[in-house]
Each structure stands twice: as C-alpha cells, then as structure tokens.
Interface confidence: low
C-alpha cells in the first residue's frame, strides 16, 4: 500500500478544508520541477523566478547572470538557447502552437560579446525550427518547409533545400503523422557531434489524403483547415534521409542515405537517427507492418563523398508476438568504441531489458534481467551505465535510477534512488551533465515532488534544487484524499490499480465509484506520482472513490500483458476494467448502483465500450474526444496494433470494434459525449459518427462540443469542461450541488 505521508493530526481536523473545483481549475496546488539546462560537465543554465538567465558553476559555487530579464523583455522572449561557444543566445518570441510538439516563433540573436542584437541578415519569420550546432555557433533553421544554414549568426543564409511546400514537402520538420506518432518531436534534423554534418528527413505528403475541418473563428465564413493525415490503410508519407557537409554545403550538396533493402521492398517508416561520430550515423527503419525494425549503421566514404550502409552493419529486431518495441522502437546508446551499443528490447522471457550488441543481435549480451522492465537508458560513460526500471519491490508503477558499473567485471548494479527518500520518492527521472560528472534527480512522487543535484561519481546529494515548500505549506490545511496502489490477481493476469479514497474513508460505508481509464497500448495509469487534480477534488469534496486500473495492453509488466491486445483493440482493455469493477464491488465499500466510468482519447473509446458492454455495471459515463472507429485514426498508431483494414488482413475486427456497432447498448446508461471541433488528432468525425448512430438507434444521450478546440480542450474550455462533467457526475450519483 502506498499512503500519502500524513500531514494531519486529529486535533487539527476542524481547521482543515476539502479541495474545491476552483482550486483545481486555478492550478492552486501545482508543483515545480527543476531540470538544469546543462552546458558542460559542471555548469548549467536556469531561468530565475524574475526571468534572468543565470549560469551556475557547481564546482566553484559561483553563479552569474548571462542574460538579463530586461534583454528578454525587450523582444518579449519566452525561451532562449545559448550557442555552444557561448558567444550568442537566440531569443524566442511570438510562440504560435501548431500540433502537439510543433510551433512557430520569431527568433532574435543576441551577441553576448558586445551586448547587442545581431543586425544584418536577420532571420526570417516565423521560423518552424531553429537550433545551434553542437560546437561553435552555426545555425540550422527551417522556414517555409525548407532548411537553411548559417555559418555564423550574422552571415547570409545558405539554402539547403528548395522543394519545401506547405502540406506537400516537409524538410527538417515532420508532417503531422510523423510528429505525433513516430518522432514525437517538432524537428527532423540532427547535427553530427561536432557539427560537421547535418542530417535531415524529407517527408513527401503529396499523395496523402487530407482531413478537412472548419475553424469557425470570428469571420463571416469559417476557415477550412487541411492536414495531410493518413488514416488506417491510407497512403503514407514517403520519407528520405539526407546528410549535408555543413563546412562545404555546396561542394557535393545533400547526400541521400540508402534504405536497407529488406525495408525498401515494401512501405516503410524512418523511426529515428542517432549520430555516433562525425562520420558514423545510425538510422532506424520500420516496415509498415510494424513487427520488423532494422537498425542500420552508416559510414561516410571520403572518396565518394557518400554514406555507405553495409549489410554487415544492419541489425534486425523482430517481434513474433506483437509489434516491434514498446510504444516506439527503442533507440541505441553507443559505447565509446563507436560501434557497439546498448539497447532495450524483449528478452526470451518477454520482458524489456538492456542488451549490449557488439556484432549481431543474436549474440547480444543481456545486461539486465528479471520479471520487471528496464525503461530508459539515460547515459553510458566509460565506466557506468545509468538506467531506470520498475524493479524495486516489484511495483510496476515506480521508477528508480540504477547505475551499472561496466568498467569492472562482473558488472555490479547499484540502485541510486531506492532509499533516498523512500516514502516521498518512488518515481524518478534524471538529467545528466557532460560525461555524467553531475546529475539532477527529479522525483515526481508519491509525495510532493523534489529536485536534487548529485555528484556523478559518488552519487552524493549536493543540494536541493526545488522542494516545493510553498506547495507543502499550502497543503497543510487541505484534506487530501488517501491513495493506495495494490493489485488484483484474476485468471493469471495481474491487474494493478490505484484507488483514491475520500479523506474520512470508512470501509463500512458505501461510496460512489468513478473509474478513470486510458488503457491505450503501452500506457500506464497506475503510477506512484503526486497529483492534485480533478479526481483528487472528487474524492476530497464529493466523497467519491476513484480507481485507475492497468489492464491488458498496458506497459512495463512484460510482453504477455502488453501484446495481449495485438490486432484486437477494444476487447481486453474493456474486459479488464469490468473485471476490476466487479472486484471492487466485492470489497464491500462500493455502492454498486452508483458506478461511473470516464476517459479521454483512447480512454474515451474504452469508457464508451465499457458503457456499451451490456453488463449493467455502469450507471453513467463520459467520453472526451474518443476514437470511435480505428478506421478513423492515424495509420502509424493504428496499424502498429491492428494491422491493416483490408479483407485479407484485419478488416473484420476494425468493423467489430467500433463504438457505433454498440449504439443500442447505450439505452440503459447516461452517456455524456464531448469533443472539440478542431481536434487535429482524434477528429470530431469520431464523435459525429457516435452521435449519428445513437440518433439512428433513437438512444438518448448528452453531448457537448467545444468550438475551435483541439484534442487538449485548453484555456477557458478546460474550466467549462470540468464544471460540466462535475455536474453530470453529481447528478448521476445523486449528490447535492
């Protein structure tokens, strides 16, 4: 059991108050984290509370302002980037969001040597992406889908690509589907370690079908947003990778990197690029049927000025039980010999573990093992490998940081974080300086988050970077709900759950139950993290019990659980939520006439199917921005788990797993359907089709749309959304307003 550390004495209970919805909507109890912006082994930058950019030297203990808030304010900068030679800073302003990661902005270059903005050959606006070279102060940027290079900030730009066209050809930035479902970045260009070469992707969306939706705005006629968006089975983007010598960019021009023959024989994806040295690069490719991935190590041929990818340097990763990798195929972390690498993939027992690959994948040496999973490799130095896993005390929803000494034989393993602040901190991430001389640990819970600085050699804590004292003080008179993380064993499946209980929880009483579900493949909802959010309020003030359950298809508990949903989305995820609810009822404190379920996105899909399961368990439920048919969602994501919607592949299950097919079953539940009309991700089409099917079946339901809002329903819509959902649930549970 994980209980929130108690901060309450009975004598003080009369001064305590419950959380309010206003607390949540105002972000009153939000926490801060501190991630150093490392610029060397012992120095980092940080933006102070008053917006100065301050350089800290850990070893001398000194700090000084490199850029004043006055300079930042002069161009309304909201972000900055220091050139590696420390001569220039770019200042970012006029931030304009596009999709999940992408945005455009205006960039100004500030010369630290003379304290002036660089004049002459200013950057065009708005820029889609801009970055410094890893050494010196070269600039690469993307403007109007083309890539430009500046040897120095004041120099005229050198245009690298010329074929960029809105919604057609993307150079150095991903198109919609690659941004959201493959790269998870706003950029698609990569500098070599010393800035000699620049690699970039070109995405050709010419043949991709376009999703079009109205953006109502304030004008007489709505605008139409057009996005090349490949849905399941549709034509996909065509990707090519090029590398250009940035020292002599016009000398040979961009050189295309060849695609491995076994990949190029049918539709494929590029999944990531990792530079090894200035003259060695590693590319990862994936077949459209995403169970085969190829890692290809390519070398620069000086004589031909080309990139050579010998077959002997191709490493194949294949899954026979599901798709390749977890959510994404993992990326390699190269060792100092610049050819061998460490990588996380499934071991023979079906658990994701770190392997060391020196020549072939078949001869890989397994570095970690057990019935738990290695989750991320943070850093490999000459003598240590730092990684995170959920091994400690067998709680899948924890993250601890480990160090393996690879310099000694046999390698020894040490948990760096397990016993640091055991009650408060069970879910960590880390950020390392150059050569791992120092690192920051960021603890997300279950207690109040705390960020600390550590010595990379001894692991000693040097100082606290952020401990959220103000938050701790603000929570002293708040009746927070209790949280417990436990597991259910059902038919050889382990279902981990988190239960959020009202502050004065009494097992002899009956409480309404709200299930919060996401449930998407390779997701995890049951995590030992701190949060004061809407469901905290529902437990604290409205006396509900809230439960989150990780069923089949969820991550970090082995391939058997993860790949159980392969080619069968919408079946086991729903079954496992229902199974858990039945178990919760057996616990004796749930009012079985007042059970609800809600979810967003994939969770909206699962909650809809659970409501339409015909079990009679749920009185009501909410689906926010749900997927309603996998034929409506993006190819890269959907086909990874479902295959293709063709007769000879998996069309039958595509058809059987829609929400619309179960319209009749909504007759006996109260259903609230919510969607933003400008959702670029899960298109409004999904909810429109649910609504149409319910109307055609003459089933009553409630609905709310948010005009011109995307998948995140942000801003004032957030307040309206949670207020609306609160009213709906209170009405469903017969709670007074």
């Amino acid at each position: 059991i994980v209980l929130r550390p108690s901060r309450v004495h009975n004598s003080e209970e009369n001064t305590m108050r419950a959380l309010t919805l206003k607390d949540i909507l105002n972000g009153t109890f939000s926490y801060k984290t501190f991630f150093p912006n490392w610029i060397s082994g012992q120095e980092y930058l940080h933006q102070s509370a008053d917006n100065n950019i301050v350089l800290y030297n850990i070893e001398t203990g000194q700090s000084y302002t490199i850029l004043s808030n006055r300079t930042m304010k002069s161009v309304n900068a909201s972000n900055y980037g220091l050139s590696p030679d420390r001569q220039f800073v770019y200042l970012e302003s006029d931030y304009s969001k596009l999709w999940r990661y992408s945005y455009t902005a205006t960039y100004y270059i500030y010369d630290l040597s003379n304290g002036e903005f660089v004049r002459g050959n200013e950057l065009p606006r708005p820029i889609q992406y801009l970055c410094w070279s890893p050494v010196g102060s070269k600039l690469a940027y993307v403007y109007q889908n083309n890539i430009y290079l500046k040897q120095r900030p004041g120099d005229p730009p050198f245009q690298i690509t010329f074929n960029g066209r809105e919604n057609k050809i993307f150079n150095g930035i991903p198109d919609w589907v690659y941004e959201e479902e493959m790269l998870a970045t706003k950029y698609a260009l990569w500098w070599s370690p010393n800035g000699k070469f620049l690699a970039y992707a070109e995405f050709n969306d010419t043949d991709i079908p376009v999703i079009a939706y109205s953006y109502y705005g304030d004008e007489q006629y709505p605008r139409t947003i057009n996005i090349p968006y490949p849905k399941a089975g549709a034509k996909n983007p065509v990707v090519r990778i090029f590398i250009i010598d940035t020292t002599y960019p016009a000398y040979v021009g961009p050189q295309e990197v060849p695609v491995p023959a076994m990949i190029a024989s049918s539709d494929y994806y590029f999944s990531w690029l990792t530079w090894v040295t200035d003259e060695r690069v590693c590319l990862q490719w994936l077949k459209r049927v995403q169970n085969v991935s190829v890692l290809s190590i390519c070398d620069f041929r000086e004589d031909w000025q080309t990139w050579d990818c010998p077959k002997t340097q191709e490493h194949i990763e294949e899954s026979r039980t599901g798709w390749a990798g977890g959510f994404f195929v993992s990326t390699p972390v190269f060792s100092y010999d610049a050819i061998s690498y460490y990588k996380i993939f499934s071991d023979k027992d079906g658990y994701k573990h770190i392997h060391y690959i020196k020549d072939t994948v078949e001869n890989a040496i397994q570095i970690t093992s057990g019935k738990w999973e290695a989750i991320n490799i943070f850093r490999v130095t000459q003598d240590s490998l730092f990684y995170s896993s959920n091994e400690f005390e067998e709680y899948p929803g924890r993250r601890n940081i480990y160090r393996i000494s690879i310099g000694s034989y046999p390698p020894s393993k040490k948990c760096v974080t397990c016993h640091l602040r055991k009650e408060r901190c069970q879910y960590y991430t880390a950020s390392f300086s150059d050569y791992a001389k120092y690192y920051a640990l960021v603890c997300y819970g279950p207690g109040i988050p705390i960020s600390t600085l550590h010595d990379g050699r001894t692991d000693q804590e040097i100082k606290i970077l952020e401990e959220n004292k103000e938050l701790e003080n603000a929570l002293k008179n708040i009746q927070l709900p209790k949280e417990e993380i436990k597991k259910l064993e059902v038919d050889e499946i382990t279902l981990w759950y988190k239960m959020i209980l009202p502050p004065q929880f009494d097992r002899s009483k009956k409480y309404p139950l709200l299930i919060q579900v996401y449930g998407g493949p390779c997701s995890q909802s049951v995590r030992s993290v701190f949060a004061v959010n809407w469901i905290s309020y529902l437990a604290s003030k409205e006396g509900m019990v809230i439960a989150l359950v990780d069923g089949r298809g969820t991550a970090f508990q082995g391939d058997k659980l993860l790949y159980a949903v392969y080619r069968k989305l919408g079946v086991y995820e729903v079954e496992d939520q229902i199974t858990a609810v039945r178990k919760f009822i057996e616990m004796g404190f749930i009012d079985e006439k007042r059970i609800a379920i809600w979810g967003w996105s994939y969770g909206g899909y699962v909650s809809s199917l659970a409501l339409a399961s015909g079990t009679g368990l749920f009185k009501c439920g909410i689906a926010v921005a749900p997927v309603s048919s996998w034929e409506y969602y993006a190819s890269v994501y959907t086909e990874r788990f479902m295959g293709l919607p063709t007769k000879d592949d998996n069309l039958e299950h595509y058809k059987n797993s829609t929400v619309m097919a179960r319209a009749e079953y909504f007759r006996n539940v109260d259903y609230l359907l919510i969607h933003g009309t400008a959702d670029d991700n899960v298109h409004f089409q999904n909810s429109a089709q649910i609504a149409k099917a319910l109307v055609n079946a003459q089933v009553d339901f409630q609905a709310m749309w948010y005009s011109d809002q995307n998948h995140g329903l942000s801003g004032l819509s957030t307040n309206h959304l949670y207020t609306h959902m609160t009213h709906f649930l209170k009405q469903c549970f017969s709670l007074s307003d």
């Epitope: 050198f158 245009q159 074929n163 016009a250 021009g253 961009p254 004589d303």
Partner: antibody, heavy 129, light 107 residues
C-alpha cells in the same frame, strides 16, 4: 578522389560534328548530387558554358549553342558525351568537362547551377580543313 | 543573359600585398549564385568560392568572397607566390556565364 578525363579527336573539319567523351573515375556518375557539364575556352571569348546533364538524362544547354549541341550520358560506362554539329573555326577551343555540385533539391525539375568543383585537364580541338 | 564584367583587367602587385578583385553583374544574381575560379597557364580552372562567400574545400583562408545582388568581390588578404594567376567569376542562373577574367601578376 573523383577525376574527369576528356577524350576525342583534336582536329575536326568545318561543317562536321565535334564529338568528345568525358570518363568519370573514382565516383559514380549516377548521384543525386551532381550534374555534369561541358565548358570551352577560347582566346577571344574566354570561358563559355556549353551545357550540362543530369544522370537521369535531363539536359540544360546554353541558348546560343542549343541548336547545335547534344549532351548524353551512359551511366553503365560512367561517361557523358558532347556532340557539337556544323562546326566552324569559331569553335576552335580547349574543351573541358566538369562536375557541378548541386544545391538544388531533388528530384530535379531542371538543372540549376552550383559551381564546377572538379574539372578535366581539357582537350584542345581545332576546327580546320 | 547576365553579363559579368570583371575589373581591373590586370592587377600588378607584390607578394604579401592585398588583392581586391571586382565582378559586376548586368542584373541581380539569383540567391548569390556566384563562384570564383583560379586558372594558371596550361591548367584547368580551380574552384575557389561558391555562393559568393563560401570557400571551396582546400582553399586557404586568405581567400574571401563578399557581395550580393550585382556587386561581388574576391579578396586575397596576403598574396603568396602561387596566387599569381587569372581569376574568373561565374554566375549560375541559366545560362551560366563567366567574367572575362582578371590577371593578377607580379609587380
């Protein structure tokens, strides 16, 4: 490293066709990143670009010579060739083949220039009866 | 067609001196698509600069290029004995054209 070598007759009679071949060694002619050109140099007119070809076969000629010029490519032999018809004494010159490094993005819709970064040593062609 | 005019026709200087060569275009050179070449007697031209200001591989940093639009300059900061040659500019809008050349000779 890449080297270019011109070959062909040094003497051509007026009104006949001048034929030269350029052999590329040390690198492939079938690269996205290069085009291949012919330039000539006369004492009177200095350096004059004749035309260029891309390995796909698309060509770009100097308008002043276009009616008389044909440039072709043989990727299997790693060669490209120049034919200049109806020659006169004014066509007497040193003929160079050269590699152009592109900065136009692929696929090429037309050959656009960069600079000629590698040249052959040149071959003298005299037009005389 | 863009005509390139180089000046002066001949430049007589001593080793160690600075050389400034000019190239003027009859119309704007697209995207500064301008190159400079060096040619010695009996040899093919050698690429020095491209894109008006970028040095080609292996070219010493005493050579620098500048300019945009219609006026371009090649500067040799300190003449070495091997720098005495004829220098040509070239633009690569179609058709590609060359300047008539500037001869840098030993004074």
């Amino acid at each position: 490293h890449v080297q270019l070598q011109e070959s062909g007759p040094g003497l051509v009679k007026p009104s006949e066709t001048l034929s030269l071949t350029c052999t590329v060694s040390g690198g492939s002619i079938s690269s996205n990143n290069y085009y291949w050109g012919w330039i000539r140099q006369t004492p009177g007119k200095g350096l004059e670009w004749i035309g260029s070809i891309y390995y796909s076969g698309s060509t770009n000629y100097n308008p002043s010579l276009k009616s008389r010029v044909t440039i072709s490519v043989d990727t299997s032999k790693n060669q490209f060739s120049l034919k200049l018809s109806s020659v006169t004494a004014a066509d007497t010159a040193v003929y160079y083949c050269a590699r152009g490094a592109r900065w136009q993005a692929r696929p090429a819709t037309r050959i656009d220039g960069v600079a000629f970064d590698i040249w052959g040593q040149g071959t003298m062609v005299t037009v005389s009866s | 067609e863009t005509t390139l005019t180089q000046s002066p026709g001949t430049l007589s200087l001593s080793p160690g001196e600075r050389a400034t060569l000019s190239c003027r275009a009859s119309q704007t050179v697209t995207r500064n698509y301008l190159a400079w070449y060096q040619q010695k007697p009996g040899q093919a031209p050698r690429l020095l600069m491209y894109g008006a200001s970028n040095r080609a591989a292996g070219v010493p940093d005493r050579f620098s290029g500048s300019g945009s639009g219609t006026d371009f300059t090649l500067t040799i900061s300190r003449l070495e004995p091997e720098d005495f040659a004829v220098y040509y500019c070239q633009q690569f809008g179609s058709p590609y054209t060359f300047g008539q050349g500037t001869k840098v000779e030993i004074k």
